[in-house]
Amino acid sequence: MAKAAAIGIDLGTTYSCVGVFQHGKVEIIANDQGNRTTPSYVAFTDTERLIGDAAKNQVALNPQNTVFDAKRLIGRKFGDPVVQSDMKHWPFQVINDGDKPKVQVSYKGETKAFYPEEISSMVLTKMKEIAEAYLGYPVTNAVITVPAYFNDSQRQATKDAGVIAGLNVLRIINEPTAAAIAYGLDRTGKGERNVLIFDLGGGTFDVSILTIDDGIFEVKATAGDTHLGGEDFDNRLVNHFVEEFKRKHKKDISQNKRAVRRLRTACERAKRTLSSSTQASLEIDSLFEGIDFYTSITRARFEELCSDLFRSTLEPVEKALRDAKLDKAQIHDLVLVGGSTRIPKVQKLLQDFFNGRDLNKSINPDEAVAYGAAVQAAILMGDKSENVQDLLLLDVAPLSLGLETAGGVMTALIKRNSTIPTKQTQIFTTYSDNQPGVLIQVYEGERAMTKDNNLLGRFELSGIPPAPRGVPQIEVTFDIDANGILNVTATDKSTGKANKITITNDKGRLSKEEIERMVQEAEKYKAEDEVQRERVSAKNALESYAFNMKSAVEDEGLKGKISEADKKKVLDKCQEVISWLDANTLAEKDEFEHKRKELEQVCNPIISGLYQGAGGPGPGGFGAQGPKGGSGSGPTIEEVD
């Protein structure tokens, strides 16, 4: 009989995750609710003990007896300033037992007190049970992860929690180390590598810098904010909508716990939606005093609401670099961990800080730590099946996969060397007013322009209702399964109408040799590709800005707010630029940028005058960062920033 598998557990502050390595690959295991992460919550009621989703779902009804954040207590003394500070924010009671903190709750009519290790052991028991339900046999061996900054006391307490849960803890490993293992960064064979792990979770933010040399991991520096995470972003949304509800309905819902809880759940859902779409809707029936609350929020507004929080994530990055005595150019790999790193703005800030460096994000960010822990568990169990050492070099997409957007640009949804299976979704839009359909052309390759890449297939999504350019939202999903079969789906979000294509390995795909040749060619052409990409990007930015400005001043809502002279000035300049663009599609980047700056010089003072004090966009609020445009024949699809 085959040896029982060992599991990897990411014991998180707000959510936990479990994975197992079997049949040559890691499987992240879903719980009985179908969720691949489980809330690190334990609730005590008059009749039962609840763990995970069930516990979190009833938190608003039973706050004093629902325990979370045990990770903030584990291995700490009661007098620890962290404990004293955190206690002020918890609805449950923390008591002092010989300078050890204990959580006091009412359970089955009695007062009970539990050590943090006991609470964590309950969460670990749940994770163990999730794995056992999936594997069909008892599990005892596990690798459990902890933050890199955890001291010996915190590590030992976590190990004790594992033992209490009936686990044989093979090893306690650092969360950033696990994430690096997940990406195979310990097996690149390229000598010493500096890896920065950016872990933005539900309630905590950790930055770690590791040096990996010949499979040896050394933590060089850690930094972060123990109270920054997805929940803070949810709070910003909740506050925003509480204020919106006040404005619309002249009622304050903030003191109604049930209404706020329902709003928070909707906000969390909206936040997740905004990572893949540029707009999210909230529909809450009878939110307060019988009033239905139907509203929406754009990604741009969400980014604005959280801008200071997002920007603040770079301070610990800088601190970690200083502490590690490294320059940002010396970081070889950037790894994203934690669900909040799905937020495009967070990714952009980090990528821009590192001057455009690629981010390792192909593994689900809230699963990366458990993934690495599962790999480590398999290694420690001496698993040689499918050669666990080479596991991570096997299942990758050998070339970037994407589609053609306006101007013949290759827009990659799945980057080369992404671990598969993987699924990526992006929102696109139309290029022309009243465009009835879009042509989805799927390519693989590393070149900037699709004409230099390999066409895998094409299909059309028709029946798009008439709308101005840039308004329709076409959701395109690239989904590669474990066998390398690619499914591309396009859905018009307004109608739900969809079309898809399936591309298998043997249909129009490239051989190993061709892939190798294309990779080498791509290196050779990188410089000229970059020039071309920048040129098209500058052209698209100019075109977008011109059309945005034109439609902005033509907006009926601005009647009486803008003088005819100013309106004419903007429209004349837009006309000049748009006509110039039509005649100069092959102009240089400098020329496009010059025209954009010229147009901004005319428009920005006029537009900003309209929005000063109006809560709308500030100077250049309709900015050059609008939908990217381009030229091309046929129904063109356009990327949405």
Epitope: W580, D582, A583, A587, H594, K597, E598, Q601, P605, G620
Partner: antibody
Framework: QIQLVQSGAEVKKPGASVKVSCKAS????????MNWVRQAPGQGLEWMGW????????TYADDFKGRFTFTTDTSTSTAYMELRSLRSDDTAVYFC?????????WGQGTLVTVSS | EIVLTQSPDSLAVSLGERATINCKSS????????????LAWYQQKAGQSPKLLIY???TRESGVPDRFSGSGSGTDFTLTIDSLQAEDVAVYYC????????FGGGTKVEIK
């Protein structure tokens, strides 16, 4: 009335830097771009580039990329042109010129002499 | 980049006579949407800053005497001074703003 007043003549040694200022008055500074034009002794006009006074984004002509920097201080309605690593062939009169759709108002020019 | 070639380099004309200056562009300066040619003319007197005379090929800047006129389209443009006056002695430059900006080499106008 609209005026662009430039800083006085400068004499510099090769390798040094110079910063020419151009103070605008009589109009809203951030509503119009500011161009810089060079005229070497006995030569024609050369467009160096311009700065978007609203966003602060500069544009440099090909021959003026690298050692030249355009900046603005909107609080004083002043545009600046800095030139580093001066060479003898940088000796010229430097003009600032307001730009709407044409260069309609010009500064009086600043003579920069580079001599060892 | 667009190159503007002015001719002649210098020109001596009697007072009251007509002076004609040409400016040839390496590419068309006509924007078909606005139907404008993005060419301007500047006058620079000795020791002074340049002064705008004409923009969009033929539109006179306010305060410029009507003896100055501009014409042309596409790549060929002309500045005409109908009846030369003593105060018209200067160097005249054409400038394009179709894409980025460039000046012509200048034409020196003197009294014969």
């Amino acid at each position: 009335q609209i005026q662009l007043v430039q800083s006085g003549a400068e004499v510099k040694k090769p390798g040094a830097s110079v910063k020419v200022s151009c103070k605008a008055s009589g109009y809203t500074f951030t509503n119009y771009g500011m161009n810089w034009v060079r005229q070497a002794p006995g030569q024609g006009l050369e467009w160096m580039g311009w700065i978007n006074t609203y966003t602060g984004e500069p544009t440099y002509a090909d021959d003026f990329k690298g050692r030249f920097t355009f900046t603005t201080d909107t609080s004083t309605s002043t545009a600046y042109m800095e030139l580093r690593s001066l060479r003898s062939d940088d000796t010229a009169v430097y003009f600032c010129a307001r730009y709407d759709h044409v260069m309609d108002y010009w500064g009086q020019g600043t003579l920069v002499t580079v001599s060892s | 980049e667009i190159v503007l070639t002015q001719s002649p380099d210098s020109l001596a004309v009697s007072l009251g006579e007509r002076a004609t200056i040409n400016c040839k562009s390496s590419q068309s300066l006509l924007n078909s949407g606005t139907r404008k040619n993005y060419l301007a003319w500047y006058q620079q007197k000795a020791g002074q800053s340049p002064k705008l005379l004409i923009y969009w090929t033929s539109t006179r800047e306010s305060g410029v005497p009507d003896r100055f006129s501009g014409s042309g389209s596409g790549t060929d443009f002309t500045l005409t001074i109908d009846s030369l006056q003593a105060e018209d002695v200067a160097v005249y430059y054409c400038k394009q703003s179709y894409t980025l900006y460039t000046f012509g080499g200048g034409t020196k106008v003197e009294i014969k």
